[in-house]
Amino acid sequence: MMTGTIETTGNISAEKGGSIILQCHLSSTTAQVTQVNWEQQDQLLAICNADLGWHISPSFKDRVAPGPGLGLTLQSLTVNDTGEYFCIYHTYPDGTYTGRIFLEVLESSVAEHGARFQIP
């Protein structure tokens, strides 16, 4: 039975040209995290594998930085980066947990963080 929950940074906003940290945290389970995938819609951004470390997709390697932790840092943001991001936790023995973050990239300097929320 899957008992865990994913806590994410929720709905966030950031300035064009700036950077943002995407963070998820898996709690309420003793399952072992074996791999975390970061995806934007259906596009793979990065993988963090417990054994192998980070794989950053080649098309994002110049502006995606691993970490902190299992999170992901997006740099040199453009308006096109606005959208949904997913952290997909592969765990043993539970299976897969998915968290969702919505990022809005703003032209102005009025970027502010939304509240944290949980996805069961």
């Epitope: 074996t34 793979l44 594998n49 980070w54 794989h55 080649p58 390697k61 592969h90 043993y92």
Partner: antibody
């Protein structure tokens, strides 16, 4: 066109070291991780290790117990694999292989370098 | 380490036949499985990754399926150039092991 061109065949004595090179072209060298895989005569494939050409960070197969060292030269887009304390069981074809765009599999391979260990 | 069991180890078939090769893993690897083709004296060539995604330029007669612990590579209609050795590999953690290989021979 992506190409991985490896150095030529080597014959080594037991206890010696060998260093095999793999020159990459046709893509941005630092955007893709590089792996090394070996194949003993008539046998299957064995993963040896992985290097991130950007940072030089490495991961190794424990089976090689510190005998393998992976390095890169970014200026020439070349990856290197050095294997030390050679024994006859290390006689094999050694391949460099580029990590795919979507995970830890291998989308392009070098032609292979035959290393023969014999006294 | 996750164990890989590939079967059969060898297989005789004729041009036009439908062929299936299976790969089993000792633990759940989700869909993180790749298939390679190797011809004598040549480097392996990627066919499939993520269990079912085609590598560039791979003919549509090849297909991959499965998830969890059971995976298959199917060749729908064998062509003369398909006689080779096929390997599965899980790409989910060290030591990125390969199956023992399946040698596909002409009957």
């Amino acid at each position: 066109e992506v190409q991985l061109v490896q150095s030529g065949a080597e014959v080594k004595k037991p206890g010696a070291s060998v260093k095999v090179s793999c020159k990459a072209s046709g893509y941005t060298f630092t955007n893709y991780y590089m792996h090394w895989v070996r194949q003993a005569p008539g046998q299957g494939l064995e993963w040896m290790g992985r290097i991130d050409p950007t940072s030089g960070a490495t991961k190794y197969n424990d089976n090689f117990k510190g005998r393998v060292t992976l390095t890169v030269d970014k200026s020439t887009s070349t990856a290197y694999m050095e294997l030390s304390s050679l024994r006859s069981e290390d006689t094999a074809v050694y391949y460099c292989a580029r990590e795919g765009g979507f995970g830890y599999y291998f989308d392009y391979w070098g032609q292979g370098t035959t290393v023969t260990v014999s006294s | 380490d996750i164990q890989m069991t590939q079967s059969p180890s060898s297989l005789s078939a004729s041009v036009g036949d439908r062929v299936t090769i299976t790969c089993r893993t000792s633990e759940n690897i989700f869909t993180y499985l790749a298939w390679y083709q190797q011809k004598p004296g040549k480097a392996p060539k990627l066919l499939i990754y993520n269990a079912k995604t085609f590598a560039e330029g791979v003919p549509s007669r090849f297909s991959g399926s499965g998830s969890g612990t059971d995976f298959t590579l199917t060749i729908s209609s064998l062509q003369p150039e398909d006689f080779a050795t096929y390997y599965c590999q899980h790409h989910y953690g060290i030591p990125l092991p390969f199956g023992q290989g399946t040698k596909l021979e002409i009957k």
